[in-house]
Amino acid sequence: SAHAHPRDSCPLGPGRCCHLETVQATLEDLGWSDWVLSPRQLQLSMCVGECPHLYRSANTHAQIKARLHGLQPDKVPAPCCVPSSYTPVVLMHRTDSGVSLQTYDDLVARGCHCA
Amino acid sequence: SAHAHPRDSCPLGPGRCCHLETVQATLEDLGWSDWVLSPRQLQLSMCVGECPHLYRSANTHAQIKARLHGLQPDKVPAPCCVPSSYTPVVLMHRTDSGVSLQTYDDLVARGCHCA
């Protein structure tokens, strides 16, 4: 039901289910070396891992999706691991008039869930 | 860059990329037949399809994810198709004291993007 409880224990084994993971990336990796000046190395937290039935369900829709995927796996995809919240990131970058510091609110994941 | 433009034309062919699709589901399918009284048949809009590079990117994070997936496909998953917004749905359901109408805000997808 819509009252079903999302579960937090991973039935697939440690590190297999949806979680936050840090990925190192350079500005060159991101294609940003022409406009971002600092930081030159980014610690990018991303959401990775599988979403088994009802694991960290984002909401009622995700619970429905998990249920219908079990019934119609060819038609309804399993929920997938995406950010539930973000960490602000300060970038020093070029502007038309010089250099600017700007905070980006949607760049690095802080938490993950299955949607 | 964070200025990259998410694209809206599907390079994989019609209907293959992330989009909204209606799935018919009965209360039995959802395991809700013991508490939901109406509607007895639900038109569930869900997000399905693939997320090729920069297609309908949800935000800067999704653009980064797409880029890093191209560089490290084993380590960074591709963005996936999830709801960007929801349509409220009214359900008539049993309560301890009788029957109630309740609006659910997170049950049916209204739009999709790649996150």
Epitope: T22, S33, D34, L37, S38, P39, R40, Q41, L42, Q43, S45, T87, P88, V89, V90, L91, M92, V99, L101, T103, L107, V108, R110 | -
Partner: antibody
């Protein structure tokens, strides 16, 4: 307006561990791109970068001190800390905490705290 | 480590007159992106250092426009167009191209 405040003992005995904490107010310590940094200044001398920590917990240390330094962060308290082990009189200095964009652009500093190493 | 050398060690100045401080690095601070990774700081007597200039020539927020940074590669200059009494203190350059960041020895600016 971001403010930083160092705290910790002003006197440490030789061979012991120097421990300092920097409390950040007026902003979250959990921001990407920001490196929370320790810098020291020996009496009447210039500045020396000790090391820094990113929001993710990644640390960067001056190779000249690396074997003795540990920097950690406590996001729940909006604090970061410095531990310097096996201190000698040469570690007597004013210790500053600062906010950097990566390891440059130190735009906010604590007022500094003098730590004397003496028996 | 990159070695930073400042000159002069001490600079007596007259209010209203210009002043210039030199900073030299043991290797080029010019990044492939075209920017020089060099900061300038001022430490006023009894205070913490404050950021004046970053990336060689960009004034930090709130810094008066009488301060300017120039130079490229290994040779850099901080100029004060018209010195004011409040500008006294020790000026430091710092390279930020490589870890560890390293500071120059400082230039003490005092009123004549």
């Amino acid at each position: 307006q971001v403010q930083l405040q160092e705290s910790g003992p002003g006197l440490v005995k030789p061979s012991q561990t120097l421990s300092l904490t920097c409390t950040v107010s007026g902003g979250s310590i959990s921001s990407g791109g920001i490196y929370w940094t320790w810098i020291r200044q020996h009496p009447g001398k210039g500045l020396e970068w000790i090391g820094a920590i990113a929001y993710s917990g990644s640390t960067y240390y001056n190779p000249s001190l690396k074997s003795r330094v540990t920097i950690s962060v406590d996001t729940s308290k909006n604090q970061f800390s410095l531990k310097l082990s096996s201190v000698t009189a040469a570690d007597t200095a004013v210790y500053y905490c600062a906010r950097g964009i990566e390891y440059q652009h130190f735009d906010y500093w604590g007022q500094g705290t003098l730590v004397t190493v003496s028996s | 480590d990159i070695v930073m050398t400042q000159s002069p060690l001490s600079l007596p100045v007259t209010p209203g007159e210009p002043a210039s401080i030199s900073c030299r690095s043991s290797q080029s601070l010019l990044h492939s992106n075209g920017y020089n990774y060099l900061d300038w700081y001022l430490q006023k007597p009894g205070q913490s250092p404050q950021l004046l200039i970053y990336l060689g020539s960009n004034r930090a927020s709130g810094v008066p426009d009488r301060f300017s940074g120039s130079g490229s590669g290994t040779d850099f200059t901080l100029k004060i167009s018209r010195v004011e009494a409040e500008d006294v203190g020790v000026y430091y350059c710092m390279q930020t191209l490589e870890l560890p960041p390293t500071f120059g020895g400082g230039t003490k600016v005092e009123i004549k």
